[in-house]
Amino acid sequence: APFDDDDKIVGGYNCEENSVPYQVSLNSGYHFCGGSLINEQWVVSAGHCYKSRIQVRLGEHNIEVLEGNEQFINAAKIIRHPQYDRKTLNNDIMLIKLSSRAVINARVSTISLPTAPPATGTKCLISGWGNTASSGADYPDELQCLDAPVLSQAKCEASYPGKITSNMFCVGFLEGGKDSCQGDSGGPVVCNGQLQGVVSWGDGCAQKNKPGVYTKVYNYVKWIKNTIAANS
């Protein structure tokens, strides 16, 4: 995959409090994945984050402290993509319907779905509460952020021969040092205000020539919209 005080997400930084208002934490007694709020009642996450019981935690910054802005809402429906493939992580996307509507405010708000595929070189924001150490384990309490560029599909495929499908793309740095990591899965990759990616997989974290691999949300916009319509 499915990781110093200077290494956040890995190699990122402490997000400003509630500056990523669409970021959610999926909890089953412990934080296990991230997700993105796309409307008042629906969250996008990764297919491999599927569990039968999930509590969605919105408005979080420090996941170990009640800071007063949180909304904890149980999942009413959890819908993994019908073509999700556990062995290849193709179609690694999932929708969660909340049992009640989120209260939208300055600290909890939605992120737009993409209107075009991610363009090479575009700078994106990746966030999550995953491991912040590329070697060893250091799980942060506070949300971590990383600015990283979309890599070309050619570089992505060269990094992972035979493993990259058209539903995946790479974001990050071939020199290593900055990446998402264990615990970030399902979380957002936002480029120009649109949810372009879902944290999915990678060979280790922040390793040279092994960038993070993300689900290409653009390919699933129709599925997302149809699924929400069929389950409203």
Partner: antibody, heavy 126, light 106 residues
């Protein structure tokens, strides 16, 4: 193919620390999750915990206060320490590799075990 | 903690018989259920993962089904080499095993 071999003292005194090492051969330890499981004689299996080669760990809540796992990728080994042992810790201890295909997904979840060591018997007795 | 209740704890059947073992979870675990075979003095061997998927190299007489809380493991035609103890295992939240089912030949 990947093979696992547990090693360590077969006899540990009560209140001391049990230390075991699992050596991975025939493949790289990198980018996988690795488990420890134990089985008292004539009884069922009990999961002890899991470590990723990044060093991240999850332990069985009932054993968490006594368990420490570590990994040494340069030696292709991972280790288990269980402190303050009693006779109830007498068992066959197994190491195993996680079932996840790559060990590359970035979630915190659990899968199962597809490759196991042959097990090593540890007796706790004075 | 999720508890796994396996039944029966032991059974005796003839060669060629159909053998069924059940496993019940204390809460919904989706399909995060694996089945293992353990022969005396040996380590467990994975047979079925995600409730119904046959591990590579495992004979097709072994199968699994179920979702949620109730799961079934079947040997369609018992062979002498199938004498072993079989365990279910949930992986939905941490990992726990069932108590095991010892299968013997009549």
């Amino acid at each position: 193919q990947v093979q696992l071999q547990e090693s360590g003292p077969g006899l540990v005194k009560p209140s001391e620390t049990l230390s075991l090492t699992c050596t991975v051969s025939g493949g790289s330890i990198s980018s996988h999750y690795w488990h420890w499981i134990r089985q008292p004689a004539g009884k069922g299996l009990e999961w002890i915990g899991r470590i990723h080669t990044s060093g991240s760990t999850f332990y069985n809540p009932s054993l968490k206060s006594r368990v420490t796992m570590s990994v040494d990728t340069s030696k292709n080994q991972f280790s288990l320490k269980l402190s303050s042992v009693t006779a109830a810790d007498t068992a066959v201890y197994y190491c195993a590799r996680d079932l996840t295909n790559y060990g590359w997904s970035k979630s915190i979840r659990f899968y199962g075990m597809d490759v196991w060591g042959q097990g090593t018997t540890v007796t706790v007795s004075s | 903690d999720i508890q796994m209740t396996q039944s029966p704890s032991s059974l005796s059947a003839s060669v060629g018989d159909r053998v069924t073992i059940t496993c019940q979870a204390s809460q919904d675990i989706s399909n995060y259920l694996n089945w293992y075979q353990q022969k005396p003095g040996k380590a467990p061997k994975l047979l079925i993962y995600d409730a119904s998927n046959l591990e590579t190299g495992v004979p097709s007489r072994f199968s699994g089904s179920g979702s949620g809380t109730d799961f079934t493991f079947t040997i369609s035609s018992l062979q002498p080499e199938d004498i072993a103890t079989y365990y279910c295992q949930q992986t939905d939240n941490f990992i726990t095993f069932g108590g095991g089912t010892k299968v013997e030949i009549k």
